[in-house]
């Protein structure tokens, strides 16, 4: 059996070397001479001879000065043998635990740590961390128990210790109340972490803690009046620059000012913020009445995007705004005139009398009026009073120039101020129907096949309005009854069913309708039909040789 | 000499609102950090709020979170603690005291608010 | 509960010296120096007799001064008089809010 009792070396030892840990014994040695000999990691495999074993004695030693944190423990096997080299015992593990000196100094894992904290920021609240480590053994002894300490902070306003760091964790914490970005936006500690509880080695690193920006300063009005001046009427025109100055964190939303008229009950005035300067930008956002009101004096007070963190008083500004008189255009009253006229209105009568206000007030201005959009050339103005006439036939039914029974037309009043000023109004004539349009089919041109035909719808149109309309009456004329029938399709009778009464030659073939609208006002039309060689719904139709017939029925 | 002052005690059914003050003197009011400690009849001292000097930060026990409300008025060197859904367990002595030096001193001489039926 | 642990009584007869203890955690007492010791007459407001460990304010008796080892604290008053007697408190530093923990008190009696 082996005696070996536990080995530990110290790290960097001073020597001489090599120098004895234990002696190793087998009890075979009782029996006879033994031999002593090791392998494993630092005796034959590297780091090899940094153990040795006196082959004879059994004595272990070490070569040369050992280094925990490279390696902590040693694996060996000891190894025992007779004088004819046969083992005497089976290898017997070696453990050699390197134990730890105190030749390591912490380490930060940064050189500089950077940390933010709020201006303002109450005592506790925690700001950041910084971390050292130590290669030393911590588990067996002190010598990497690093504790963290603050050496030094700049500036040392508003007072020498703004900052506290957790010994035992590195996490720095605001202990002092008054941090305010605006006198000091940074401070710069420097931070020592020490080994042995602090008491041991050392070693410094810079914290960089950035002082963050709340709303805790206003934005001032510098200076607190202001002029300006604007044309009347004009909207969205600067009419003066207002300034302002902030001791916050520019272009963020602490800084940004939010201006407010507080005396703009008709919103007749905005103002916007310059995004760059902060500028306060006053603006017609209405146009404005010279003849009504000729100045405003404005209270303009300033705030920021965001709300004030702390009680703040806020500035105002007063602007004088003087609105200048300027040649506006006369104004129809109404701007838009509905007047309701028959189609069949006499060509030469006075429809109506459309004229405008003069709004200048201050000016004393002839008005005269003219046409400026007749499409259908239909009347015609008397330029001192305004009275409309009609100089041609009215008609509803002109599609291209009435829309919805509505003829449009604009009429214009021009001063004689300086500039010319022009004002534009609208007329519409409302013209109510007159039965004046028969009815009339659509399509006018129809397809059958010669065999099994399909019956053709028929639509009846009249362009005139109800109660000129349908129910219409229908009738075959001219002998067309012979060959063909017609039936209402609907119960208004909007449209009719056409077809043949018996099978017919392939051939063109015209048939005379008579329509009737509800006023019997009638119209005979020929409708065209072609009669195709196919069967059921005729497509396209392919005719054979036209039947000689001049009118077939 | 720095001094506080605390005032607006008294007897409040629960469910009721008292606010109280504490006047301070002898410093620069709007530089340090102020609280709000009270402590129950027989009991020891419980930390209820704080504020920093500019007022822009506050801080509440979860005892009272929601129903109290600290506030300053710098102008006036004042301290306010409303007070609001008081209840039996805010009977005590409140005190207000200034921060510095990582510690609370001085304090005043602190005011009685008894919260009862 | 307190966050920092006192004794509730202790007490001594005149010109003896007595500590009262007050122990925390690494996160209050163990990680920063600022410990203070206030005392408390019956019906009075605290008074700071201690700060930041062992600093005595200005008007303080040099027969109380504190002491801290590891995560306790300790306040020692030698040469105990009548006036001694009252409660002490300790208070700490710690991150985060609240800023400041207490200690539940000590009542110290004068025989």
């Known amino acids: 059996d082996w005696v070996i009792p536990p080995i530990s070396c110290p790290e960097n030892e001073k020597g001489p070397f090599p120098k004895n840990l234990v002696q190793i014994k087998s009890n075979k040695d009782k029996e006879g001479k033994v031999f002593y000999s090791i392998t494993g990691q630092g005796a034959d495999t590297p780091p090899v001879g940094v153990f040795i074993i006196e082959r004879e004695t059994g004595w272990l030693k070490v070569t040369e000065p050992l280094d925990r944190e490279r390696i902590a423990t040693y694996t060996l096997f000891s190894h025992a043998v007779s004088s004819n080299g046969n083992a005497v015992e089976d290898p017997m593990e070696i453990l050699i635990t390197v134990t730890d000196q105190n030749d390591n100094k912490p380490e930060f894992t940064q050189e500089v740590f950077k940390g933010s904290v709020m201006e303002g920021a109450l005592p506790g609240t925690s700001v950041m961390e910084v971390t050292a480590t130590d290669a030393d053994d911590d588990v067996n002894t002190y010598n990497a128990a690093i504790a963290y300490t603050i050496l030094s902070q700049d500036p040392e306003l508003p007072d020498k210790n703004m900052f506290t760091i957790n010994r035992n964790t590195g996490v720095i914490s605001v202990v002092t109340t008054g941090l305010d970005r605006e006198s000091f936006p940074t401070y710069t500690l420097v931070v020592q972490a020490a080994d042995l509880q602090g008491e041991g080695l050392s070693t410094t690193a810079t914290a960089v803690i950035t002082v963050t920006d709340t709303n805790d300063n206003p934005p001032i009005f510098n200076p607190t009046t202001y002029k300006g001046q604007v044309p009347e009427n004009e909207a969205n025109v600067v009419i003066t620059t207002l300034k302002v100055t902030d001791a916050d964190a520019p272009n963020t939303p602490a800084w940004e000012a939010v201006y407010t008229i507080l005396n703009d009950d008709g919103g007749q005035f905005v103002v916007t913020t310059n995004p760059v300067n902060n500028d306060g930008i006053l603006k017609t956002a209405k146009g404005l009445d010279f003849e009504a009101k000729q100045q405003y004096i404005l209270h303009v007070a300033v705030t920021n995007v965001v709300p004030f963190e702390v009680s703040l008083t806020t500035s105002t500004a007063t602007v004088t705004v003087d609105v200048l008189d300027v040649n506006e255009a006369p104004i129809f009253v109404p701007p838009e005139k509905r007047v309701e006229v028959s189609e069949d209105f006499g060509v030469g009568q006075e429809i109506t009398s459309y004229t405008a206000q003069e709004p200048d007030t201050f000016m004393e201005q002839k008005i005269t009026y003219r046409i400026w959009r007749d499409t259908a050339n239909w009347l015609e103005i008397n330029p001192d009073t305004g009275a409309i006439s009609t100089r041609a036939e009215l008609d509803r039914e002109d599609f291209e120039h009435v829309k919805n029974s509505t003829y449009t037309a604009l009429i214009i009043a021009t001063d004689n101020g300086s500039p010319v000023a022009t004002g534009t109004g609208t007329l519409l004539l409302i013209l109510s129907d007159v039965n004046d349009n028969a009815p009339i089919p659509e399509p006018r041109t129809i397809f059958f096949c010669e065999r099994n035909p399909k019956p053709q719808v028929i639509n009846i149109i009249d362009a005139d309005l109800p109660p000129n309309t349908s129910p219409f009456t229908a009738e075959l004329t001219h002998g067309a009854s012979a060959n063909w029938t017609i039936q209402y399709n609907d119960p208004t009778q909007e449209s009719i069913i056409l077809k043949p009464k018996m099978a017919l030659e392939v051939g063109d073939y015209k048939i005379n309708l008579k329509l009737m609208d509800n006023q019997n006002k009638d119209q005979v039309t020929t409708l065209e039909v072609s009669v195709c060689d196919c069967e059921g719904a005729a497509g396209v139709c392919r005719k054979a040789q036209p039947v000689e017939a001049g009118l077939q029925i | 000499e720095v001094q506080l002052l605390e005032s607006g005690g008294g007897l409040v059914q629960p469910g009721g609102s008292l606010r109280l003050s504490c006047a301070a003197s002898g410093f620069t009011f709007s530089s340090y950090a102020m609280s709000w400690v009270r402590q129950a009849p027989g009991k020891g001292l419980e930390w209820v709020s704080a504020?920093?000097?500019?007022?822009?930060?506050?801080y509440y026990a979860d005892s009272v979170k929601g129903r109290f409300t600290i506030s300053r008025d710098n102008s006036k060197n004042t301290l306010y603690l409303q007070m609001n859904s008081l209840r039996a367990e805010d009977t005590a002595v409140y005190y207000c005291a200034k921060w510095g030096d990582g510690t609370l001193n001085p304090w005043g001489q602190g005011t009685m608010v008894t919260v009862s039926s | 509960q307190s966050a920092l642990t006192q004794p509730a009584s202790v007490s001594g007869s005149p010109g003896q010296s007595i500590t009262i203890s007050c122990t925390g955690t690494?996160?209050?007492?163990?990680?920063?120096?600022?410990v203070s010791w206030y005392q408390q007459h019956p019906g009075k407001a605290p008074k700071l007799m201690i700060s930041e460990v062992n600093k005595r304010p200005s008007g303080v008796s040099n027969r109380f001064s504190g002491s801290k080892s590891g995560n306790t604290a300790s306040l020692t008053i030698s040469g105990l008089q009548a006036e001694d007697e009252a409660d002490y408190y300790c208070?700490?530093?710690?991150?985060?809010?609240?800023?400041?923990?207490f200690g539940g008190g000590t009542k110290l009696t004068v025989l």
């Open positions: 504020i920093s000097g500019s007022g822009g930060s506050t």
């Open positions: 208070s700490s530093f710690t991150s985060g809010l609240p800023w400041v923990v």
């Open positions: 690494s996160n209050d007492v163990g990680a920063y120096n600022y």
